[in-house]
Interface confidence: medium
Amino acid sequence: ASVATELRCQCLQTLQGIHPKNIQSVNVKSPGPHCAQTEVIATLKNGRKACLNPASPIVKKIIEKMLNSDKSN
């Protein structure tokens, strides 16, 4: 069974390369009983979803930028 079906994680694997301009919003799900790992789920401008690697420096920058833009709105 995959990680997703073994726990209740939503991220089967993470997308390695993604350009920030393609991202509409980002949701960071903290670990919990449903899933032992932090999950970063991006909603893309085409409406699709993608899981990003929370340990990636680029992803960390994207999250920081998104959170800052949320605060300024």
Epitope: A1, E6, R8, K29, G32, H34, I41, T43, A50
Partner: antibody
Framework: EVQLLESGGGLVQPGGSLRLSCAAS????????MSWVRQAPGKGLEWVSA????????YYADAVKGRFTISRDNSKNTLYLQMNSLRAEDTAVYYC??????????????????WGQGTPVTVSS | DIQMTQSPSSLSASVGDRVTITCRAS??????LHWYQQKPGKAPKLLIY???NLESGVPSRFSGSGSGTDFTLTINSLQPEDFATYYC?????????FGQGTKLEIK
């Protein structure tokens, strides 16, 4: 055809036990999480329990924790709910539901997309 | 636990009407929300998954929107077969929780 068929419901006295079964067909049973959901007479839907595809992870509502046990036999394509120490408030129609994981690239989500017809459980003396 | 609150709890409408049902989560759940329809004596049926995606075979007069804590199910041009009870459900975390339901009745 994708199908779920519950059985095992009936009348039981308070403090008694019952085991519900849910026979699955038409899909790869071992790949998907499954849930039990109940509905008391005239009331709304209440999630009871869920189990992962392999059976290695289980989840329960607080109201049934310690009394109910969810399990599955993937070789028989069957889901179970063992209900012990039954109370009057457990009276309900019990549904099993498949948690279809809609898979987009790099993303998985859980929706109860196939339901059984339900089996009634009455706890009364 | 995440509480889901639906409003209204009941609603009367006529064939052809446009109706809106709302669902509010007690904390942010992103778009981890589904909508179900249930008719008397029948099992629930999935209508909308992940807040806004139409389940296969569901008529396009049904639509969903929202993210975070506030969600909406809209039915455009009500048909006789749409009179039923509607439930929202979050799967952001366990325990999974449903709204209390909205009963849609014929006026």
């Amino acid at each position: 055809e994708v199908q779920l068929l519950e059985s095992g419901g009936g009348l039981v006295q308070p403090g008694g036990s019952l085991r519900l079964s849910c026979a699955a067909s038409g899909f790869t049973f071992s790949e998907l999480s499954m849930s039990w959901v109940r509905q008391a007479p005239g009331k709304g839907l209440e999630w009871v329990s869920a189990i992962s595809g392999s059976g290695g992870s289980t989840y329960y509502a607080d109201a049934v924790k310690g009394r109910f046990t969810i399990s599955r036999d993937n070789s028989k394509n069957t889901l179970y709910l063992q209900m012990n120490s039954l109370r009057a408030e457990d009276t309900a129609v019990y549904y099993c539901a498949r948690e279809g994981g809609r898979l987009e690239p790099y993303y998985y989500y859980y929706a109860m997309d196939v339901w059984g017809q339900g089996t009634p459980v009455t706890v009364s003396s | 636990d995440i509480q889901m609150t639906q409003s209204p709890s009941s609603l009367s409408a006529s064939v052809g009407d446009r109706v809106t049902i709302t669902c509010r989560a007690s904390q942010s759940i992103s778009d981890n929300l589904h909508w179900y329809q249930q008719k008397p004596g029948k099992a629930p049926k999935l209508l909308i998954y992940d807040a806004s995606n139409l389940e296969s075979g569901v008529p396009s007069r049904f639509s969903g929107s929202g993210s975070g804590t506030d969600f909406t199910l809209t039915i455009n041009s009500l048909q006789p077969e749409d009179f039923a009870t509607y439930y929202c459900q979050q799967y952001y975390s366990t325990p999974l929780t449903f709204g209390q339901g909205t009963k849609l009745e014929i006026k």
